[in-house]
């Protein structure tokens, strides 16, 4: 997962609503005991912001060493800074932990830009604002890195929450969440509410502000409104899903739905942007440009490189369209849609020359590795990673940024045929090179 800005054909027939939405009690199957309700101790346990990632406090070792750890659903290693680095305020000191065990094995993780490498071991790990348990987990002690840690981000490590298939150096290295579920009675699911501020946060504001919640082992009703809608996890490696239709302001992009998932579509909290395959990106930008044609923005803006600024409080949200992604539903021929606002896909940024104004970067970008539903998508929704039932749930987040005219939405059901054909089958080659 990249931090900062990290991601024979046939068409899915999208569209006709099946009818009224059902109340929550009837459109969701009953849950096992202990999976729902209130998780007060875990609410508000995340800090950060979309551009630099959201992090949770964890402790490692005996006596416990406290570290802030980036929550990343797009990777599967628990890796922490374990040597001095200019951007780290603190790091894991294995020699101070009486419970550290060396696995005598190295790990090297290259990204398109940057890399980290380290030494594998295990130690006792807990999450102070999480379940009241301690687990022995695999830890990659990062001894060397390049363009991995972010200056001022305030996190010192990464918690990869995806599946073992994409763990490094190979799938035999059990990810943290697998260890947690195996060693405790914590149910096999977690949920994320990432809260974008809607305005730039400086260092001290990030430290003081709440960034959201990671509910481990359950679903907290206070974090969302309306109904939760579930899409199947297509394959347990990344959190892979299938997009069956895309609309800009209600206008279908009318592309072969395989294009939306070429070569995969994933939900990734460790990526900032909504990243789209080249053809889809070009079609989407063309449509967004047309919808907002009252203004002529520089090309660099649409490439995500250039800020555009408005006098404070005058951002014309109404000229920018809403974007709807239709996801495969749990029932045959049934889909649902999630709709985000420009408040999600225009990312607030600030530099010294623009501090009196409201400035944004376009947070949709091109990808050569498929669709990545990053933080800008997740900030609109409460997202349930229901690993036990191999599905991901979406509901409107109680903390999403909106205006008085429009709100993010999760709506369904819709009739969509031949959705299985929207999935792309990646040729079986070696998956060992990280291309995020």
């Amino acid at each position: 997962t990249q931090h900062g800005i990290r991601l024979p054909l046939r068409s899915g027939l999208g569209g006709a609503p099946l009818g009224l939405r059902l109340p929550r009690e009837t459109d969701e199957e009953p849950e096992e005991p202990g999976r729902r309700g209130s998780f007060v101790e875990m609410v508000d346990n995340l800090r950060g912001k979309s551009g630099q990632g959201y992090y949770v406090e964890m402790t490692v070792g005996s006596p416990p060493q406290t570290l802030n750890i980036l929550v990343d659903t797009g990777s599967s290693n628990f890796a922490v800074g374990a040597a001095p680095h200019p951007f780290l305020h603190r790091y894991y000191q294995r020699q101070l932990s009486s419970t550290y065990r060396d696995l005598r094995k190295g790990v090297y993780v290259p990204y398109t830009q940057g890399k980290w490498e380290g030494e594998l071991g295990t130690d006792l790990v807990s999450i102070p604002h999480g379940p009241n348990v301690t687990v022995r987990a695999n830890i990659a002690a990062i001894t060397e890195s390049d363009k991995f840690f972010i200056n001022g981000s305030n996190w010192e490590g990464i918690l990869g929450l995806a599946y073992a298939e994409i763990a490094r150096p190979d799938d035999s290295l059990e990810p943290f969440f697998d260890s947690l579920v195996k060693q405790t009675h914590v149910p096999n699911l977690f949920s994320l509410q990432l809260c974008g501020a809607g305005f730039p946060l400086n260092q001290s504001e990030v430290l003081a502000s709440v960034g959201g919640s990671m509910i481990i082992g359950g679903i907290d009703h206070s974090l969302y409104t309306g109904s939760l809608w579930y899409t199947p996890i297509r394959r347990e490696w990344y959190y892979e899903v299938i997009i069956v239709r895309v609309e800009i302001n209600g206008q279908d992009l009318k592309m072969d739905c395989k294009e939306y998932n070429y070569d995969k579509s994933i939900v990734d909290s460790g990526t900032t942007n909504l990243r789209l395959p080249k053809k889809v990106f070009e079609a989407a930008v063309k449509s967004i440009k047309a919808a907002s044609s009252t203004e002529k923005f520089p090309d660099g803006f649409w490439l995500g490189e250039q800020l555009v600024c408005w006098q404070a409080g005058t951002t014309p949200w109404n000229i920018f369209p809403v974007i709807s992604l239709y996801l495969m539903g749990e029932v045959t021929n049934q889909s649902f849609r999630i709709t985000i606002l420009p408040q999600q896909y225009l990312r607030p940024v600030e530099d010294v020359a623009t501090s009196q104004d409201d400035c944004y970067k376009f947070a949709i970008s091109q990808s050569s590795t498929g669709t990545v539903m990053g933080a800008v998508i997740m900030e609109g929704f409460y997202v349930v990673f229901d690993r036990a039932r191999k599905r991901i749930g979406f509901a409107v987040s109680a903390c999403h940024v909106h205006d008085e005219f429009r709100t993010a939405a999760v709506e369904g059901p819709f009739v969509t045929l031949d959705m299985e054909d929207c999935g792309y089958n990646i040729p079986q080659t070696d998956e060992s090179t990280l291309m995020t």
């Epitope: 203004e295 923005f297 520089p298 800020l307 555009v308 600024c309 006098q311 005058t314 530099d351």
Partner: nanobody, 124 residues
């Protein structure tokens, strides 16, 4: 593609002078304002002086009376005449322009661009 070409930096003795220039090119939009910022090692970037398209100027208190900003609209160039330089003026100096992208090129919406910077070193 917007390009900013800065020049005129260098090393001088305290009390000396330098003239920085920044030429902007590669765009058809209107220029809303041009400015100079500076950043000394370990410090935040700060505004030195700015000039708007209507000719109005602003200066940081620390440079008032010593520095003068001006522009050549025909050449899309901004200048910073720095007199009576002091060691505390030592910094990397950056050109910043705001390009109007509002309706009809108005400045109600703008895009800010930065130059690469030019080093000014003042020794005592």
């Amino acid at each position: 593609q917007v390009q900013l070409q800065e020049s005129g930096g260098g090393s001088v003795q305290a009390g000396g002078f330098l003239r920085l220039s920044c030429a902007a090119s590669g765009y058809t939009y209107s220029t809303c304002s041009m400015a100079w910022y500076r950043q000394a090692p370990g410090k935040e970037r700060e505004l030195v002086s700015s000039i708007r398209n209507d000719g109005s100027t602003a200066y940081a208190d620390s440079v008032k009376g010593r520095f003068t900003i001006s522009q050549d609209n025909a050449k899309n160039t901004v200048y910073l005449q720095m007199n009576s330089l002091k060691p505390e003026d030592t910094a990397m100096y950056y050109c910043n322009i705001r390009i109007g992208v509002g309706p009809g090129g108005t400045c109600s919406i703008y895009a800010p661009y930065w130059g690469e910077g030019t080093q000014v070193t003042v020794s005592s």
